[in-house]
């Protein structure tokens, strides 16, 4: 008789990443009988929710349901109906909601409450919506990339299944850049983590890991830009801000009320003799870089070594995966190649920032002007953060790998979050069975 395929014994999980600038829904899939194996979970879909981050709905919370509809419908289409009720759904909100909570716990709770009610209307197994901590965001990002890179697998392989594989079990560090925060997470080499807040201990697949992590709130690319503008307008002689981080010829009017809306600019707030000011781009990388460095307080450090703002940072160790906005920005600037040195990146940024705004608009006609106008700042910020903030050097730059996806799954905290909440990363190495179940009879 002819072999007949048995129904696929798979499971699904959904995680929504409610970031400061947008929300993304990820659908993951794995073979049910291999739940505890490393590297079996993979992403089958990403749906980017159309619109801004959920914190922007604070004045119209009743519309959050509409905002989420399209991607939740997509999940309903992708996941077989028979699996809907057993598919867990998790929503994790990050720094945008942390900032809203700092302003008003009540408003943040109201937003999350409506999110929960909206997601509960779908036929999935909704497991809750919460604001994750910066430490969790860093830790889960680190788990994700190392899980996908096969670093937790004890089996030695004679072939390489993933890019960046260094054929050893040394984990990669994780560098995550969002709109409102940035995370750095890695295993230091035989170094005591001097600050308990930055220390994590994991036992994964039978191995102990002592991990350093820190999340810098307000140092995501969007909030860093607001900080820089608030700092620079303090010393402007009038309502014109000549800004080296924007292309020559670029002009934009900014409301002072918008500038001071975020808690991230509170330290620079002052009474200004105008309600609006105009940014006029002058496109100078070096001056932009200098202006950005003023956001990093390196004048005091209560530890043996710090990143900035008095935050402990051990000596960098090993390779790093830089993802989320680190990747998106560098990808846009065509600077993700392993062969591009730090000096070359700086050179390219100097050229890019100096290009006239009219020329840039013509070259990238399909890109929204708001996004397009900010790539000079974002690229310069990434260099400043990595070099002066985290102390990468021209030599150690080659250890940074700008990563969008690994094995078809997005690099980011969501996969690690789901693996943890579904107990799919065992503390001990699972006993391997000699044969897996055949899918054919």
């Amino acid at each position: 008789t002819q072999n007949k395929a048995l129904p696929e014994n798979v499971k699904y999980g959904i995680v929504l990443d409610a970031g400061s600038s947008h929300t993304s829904l990820y659908i993951y899939k794995w073979p049910a009988e291999k739940e505890n194996d490393t590297g079996v979970v993979h992403q089958v879909e990403e749906c980017r929710v159309k619109g801004p981050g959920i914190s922007k709905f604070v004045q119209k919370v009743n519309e959050i349901g509409i905002y989420l509809t399209d991607c939740m419908e997509r999940a309903r289409e992708v996941i077989p109906r028979s699996q809907h009720q057993e598919t867990p759904v998790y929503l994790g909100a990050t720094a945008g909601m942390r900032l809203l909570r700092m302003e008003s716990e009540e408003l943040a709770d109201r937003v999350l409450d409506v999110v929960e009610r909206s997601l509960s209307n779908y036929p999935f197994d909704f497991q809750g919506a919460r604001i994750i901590t910066g430490q969790e965001e860093g830790a889960y990002g680190w788990i994700t990339i190392n899980y996908l890179l096969g670093k937790f697998s004890q089996k030695t392989r004679w072939f390489s299944i993933v890019p960046y594989e260094t054929n050893n079990q040394e984990t990669f560090g994780a560098l995550d850049l969002g709109g409102a925060s940035t995370q750095v997470t890695f295993v230091p080499q035989n170094q005591t983590i001097e600050s308990p807040d930055n220390a994590l201990q994991f036992r994964l697949y039978g191995k102990d890991y002592n991990v350093y992590t820190h999340s810098f709130l307000c140092y995501g690319k969007d909030q860093a830009l607001w900080q820089k503008l608030a700092k620079d307008i303090q010393v402007a002689s009038n309502e014109i801000l000549r800004d080296p981080c924007f292309h020559p010829g670029y002009k934009k009017v900014v409301n002072v009320s918008d500038l001071y809306k975020t808690p991230c600019t509170k330290r620079f707030e002052m009474t200004l003799p105008f309600q609006q000011f105009e940014i006029q781009g002058i496109g100078n990388y070096q001056q932009c870089h200098q202006s950005i460095l003023e956001l990093f307080n390196t004048s005091y450090c209560p530890y043996s070594q710090c990143a900035f703002n008095g935050i402990f940072l051990p000596p960098l160790q090993g390779d790093f995966g830089a993802f989320s906005a680190f990747y998106f920005v560098m990808k846009f600037l065509n600077l993700t190649s392993e062969k591009v040195s730090q000096e070359k990146v700086t050179e390219m940024m100097k050229k890019f920032c100096a290009q006239p705004w009219e020329e840039i608009k013509t070259s990238y006609a399909g890109v929204k002007e708001k996004y397009l106008s900010e790539y000079c700042f974002s690229g310069t910020y990434i260099l400043s953060l990595l070099l002066q903030g985290y102390h990468f050097t021209a030599d150690s730059w080659e250890h940074i790998h700008f990563i969008g996806k690994i094995q078809g799954s997005d690099a980011g905290w969501t996969l690690g979050y789901m693996l943890n909440l579904t107990n799919m990363i065992p503390a001990e190495q699972p006993l391997s069975t000699p044969l897996s179940h055949s899918t054919y009879v």
Epitope: K56, E73, E77
Partner: antibody, heavy 121, light 106 residues
Framework: EVQLLQSGPEVVKPGATVKISCKVS????????LNWVRQYPGKNLEWVGN????????RYNQKFKGRFTITIDQSKNTAYMELRSLTSEDTAVYYC??????????????WGQGTMLTVSS | EIVLTQSPAILSLSPGERVTITCSAS?????MHWFQQKPGQAPRLWIY???NLASGIPARFSGSGSGTEYTLTISSMESEDFAVYYC?????????FGQGTKLEIK
């Protein structure tokens, strides 16, 4: 300001294939789904399908699946709909449109001016 | 698919009159949207998410409802309100429209 500019009217014979276009400007092309809707002269509106330019994923009304195909050319900021095996029943105005929330969470809904397709022998 | 049934199909009335158009869904939807269309023009969003007026829409228009029953109300008809109104659901695919209600001058 979001604008959707559709290609001009088409007159074709039954059985023919036609491709109509919708060029968008004023926003990032990958930010919103692009929908196609058709309307018989003076009659009902019917959703044909949509495309998510971010992922490339498409959805269709079952009624049109297989005969109508929605595609995009990101470099041109343009969406297309190819209509095959046309009959007189396909004579209608075809609209492209998009909707969603902007960066300030304001809801918007924009339509192209419509493309009149006449199928006649 | 979710079928939307509007009533009435045609309504003849005079300026100043109060009007209520209903839209019934064959199964529950989370929100309803309403469009106005005038001859030779593309439809224009009028009310979104059941009760929110789109930008520039006069306050004499209102929307309400939940589940399977939704209404659009005009408190006092004005000459520019004579048009065809369509309801649409965007809660599940395929997206569907009502068959339209034509408001004409008596």
């Amino acid at each position: 300001e979001v604008q959707l500019l559709q290609s001009g009217p088409e007159v074709v014979k039954p059985g023919a294939t036609v491709k109509i276009s919708c060029k968008v400007s004023g926003y990032s092309f990958t930010d919103y789904n692009l929908n196609w809707v058709r309307q018989y002269p003076g009659k009902n509106l019917e959703w044909v399908g949509n495309i998510d330019p971010y992922s490339g994923g498409t959805r269709y009304n079952q009624k049109f699946k297989g005969r109508f195909t929605i595609t995009i050319d990101q470099s041109k900021n343009t969406a297309y709909m190819e209509l095959r095996s046309l009959t007189s029943e396909d004579t209608a105005v075809y609209y492209c449109g998009l909707y969603g929330y902007d960066d300030d969470a304001n809801y918007f809904d924009d339509w192209g001016q419509g493309t009149m397709l006449t199928v006649s022998s | 698919e979710i079928v939307l049934t509007q009533s009435p199909a045609i309504l003849s009335l005079s300026p100043g009159e109060r009007v209520t158009i209903t839209c019934s869904a064959s199964s529950s939807v989370s929100y309803m949207h309403w469009f106005q269309q005038k001859p030779g023009q593309a439809p224009r969003l009028w009310i979104y998410a059941t009760s929110n007026l789109a930008s520039g829409i006069p306050a004499r228009f209102s929307g309400s409802g939940s589940g399977t029953e939704y209404t659009l109300t005009i408190s006092s008809m004005e000459s520019e309100d004579f048009a065809v109104y369509y309801c649409q659901q965007r809660s599940s695919y395929p997206l569907t429209f009502g068959q339209g209600t034509k408001l004409e001058i008596k």
